[in-house]
Interface confidence: low
């Protein structure tokens, strides 16, 4: 009696169970009563990442330099190429199909986390006692100058965008 279901890594065709092709290989011809499934390795620029009965391998992803992409990991016969973004850029999506420039943190904000090839800059507001007067993708909030340690007094209070201004103490005559 012909099978209605097949074991793992097999498929049902013409009332018989044939072996699937292993990752990195494509199907050339189904098995017969007398012959095993015929498989062929994917070419250098192609891959298949599962046990399969595909007659065509998939093309490796192209990391398009026009879109700021570069190869992070070269594809094999069993894995796709992994793209990442060039320095100063990060992916716009999880699949990294294009890149955009890293965000800069505006004055009043500092860098909480520096951008990577896959994630954008994370900014945070400078808390009281700290400031940032630049637009930067790298600089953290800096602490206000301590006038006291320089034997000076605060002449102008600091803000989240400006440092305090120190000056000499008024001496009584």
């Amino acid at each position: 009696e012909p099978p209605t279901a097949c074991r793992e890594k097999q498929y049902l065709i013409n009332s018989q169970c044939c072996s699937l092709c292993q990752p990195g290989q494509k199907l050339v011809s189904d098995c017969t009563e007398f012959t095993e499934t015929e498989c062929l390795p994917c070419s250098e620029s192609e891959f298949l990442d599962t046990w399969n009965r595909e007659t065509r391998c998939h093309q490796h992803k192209y990391c398009d330099p026009n879109l700021g992409l570069q190869v992070q990991q070269k594809g094999t016969s069993e894995t796709d190429t992994i793209c990442t973004c060039e320095e100063g850029l990060h992916c716009t999506s999880e699949s990294c199909e294009s890149c955009v420039p890293h965000r800069s943190c505006l004055p009043g904000f500092g860098v909480k986390q520096i951008a990577t090839g896959v994630s954008d800059t994370i900014c945070e507001p400078c808390p009281v006692g700290f400031f940032s007067n630049v637009s930067s993708a790298f600089e953290k909030c800096r602490p206000w100058t301590s006038c006291e340690t320089k034997d000076l007094v605060v002449q102008q209070a600091g803000t989240n965008k400006t440092d305090v201004v120190c000056g000499p103490q008024d001496r009584q005559r």
Partner: antibody, heavy 120, light 112 residues
């Protein structure tokens, strides 16, 4: 049909600046990578710059890096080339060209070109 | 940068006869997806360049079938099976694999 029309050329003194424009029509401008290519009188083609669909990525020939800036305004279907500190060797016909994308990589449609002459 | 060279730089041709232009790149323009990132352009006298062949061997839309491109890696050839008078001009190869993109110096084709 695809049309690319360059403008903004002319005679300019060395050291001055110039902005070339390229008005695009007949295709969805915001979906295409765009190039600038130039050709000095009697010479061959020289690739100058390229810009991605949304303007986030741009690349330049080493000979123009730092002086040339490619930009685009997708709302106006226009590509630009800002040329600063002009030199005699910048004298050329400047072409803007559309890139065919992944299916047809490289410039597939070209404008008629605009002449820039750098002379005192 | 990838340097492109062409030969010959000048090619006098006879109408009806075949013609062949060679283009060589200083490094391979064959990408791992199996495609050669090389284009051929023709610039007719007084005109803008026009795309003839893309990805090494594919004829662009509207290009007559007497034009064909072949080759892989670093060595490429543009063939015209039977030259016509309208084919005169300068032929350029261009690599579009990596920036900066680069053109060959051009081959000037004219009628003998």
């Amino acid at each position: 049909q695809v049309q690319l029309v360059e403008s903004g050329g002319g005679v300019v003194q060395p050291g001055r600046s110039l902005r070339l424009s390229c008005a695009a029509s007949g295709f969805t401008f915001s979906s295409y990578v765009m190039h600038w290519v130039r050709q000095a009188p009697g010479k061959g083609l020289e690739w100058v710059a390229v810009m991605s669909y949304d303007g986030s990525s741009k690349y330049y020939a080493n000979s123009v890096k730092g002086r040339f800036t490619i930009s685009r305004d997708n709302s106006k279907n226009t590509l630009y080339l800002q040329i600063n500190s002009l030199r005699a060797e910048d004298t050329a016909v400047y072409y803007c060209a559309r890139d065919g994308g992944k299916a047809v990589p490289g410039p597939d449609y070209w404008g008629q070109g605009i002449l820039v002459t750098v002379s005192s | 940068d990838i340097v492109m060279t062409q030969s010959p730089l000048s090619l006098p041709v006879t109408p009806g006869e075949p013609a062949s232009i060679s283009c060589r790149s200083s490094q391979s323009v064959l990408y791992s997806n199996g495609y050669n990132y090389l284009d051929w352009y023709l610039q007719k006298p007084g005109q803008s360049p026009q795309l003839l062949i893309y990805l090494g061997s594919n004829r662009a839309s509207g290009v007559p079938d007497r034009f064909s491109g072949s080759g892989s890696g670093t060595d490429f050839t543009l063939k015209i099976s039977r030259v016509e008078a309208e084919d005169v001009g300068v032929y350029y190869c261009m690599q579009v694999l990596q920036t900066p993109f680069t053109f060959g110096p051009g081959t000037k084709v004219d009628i003998k």
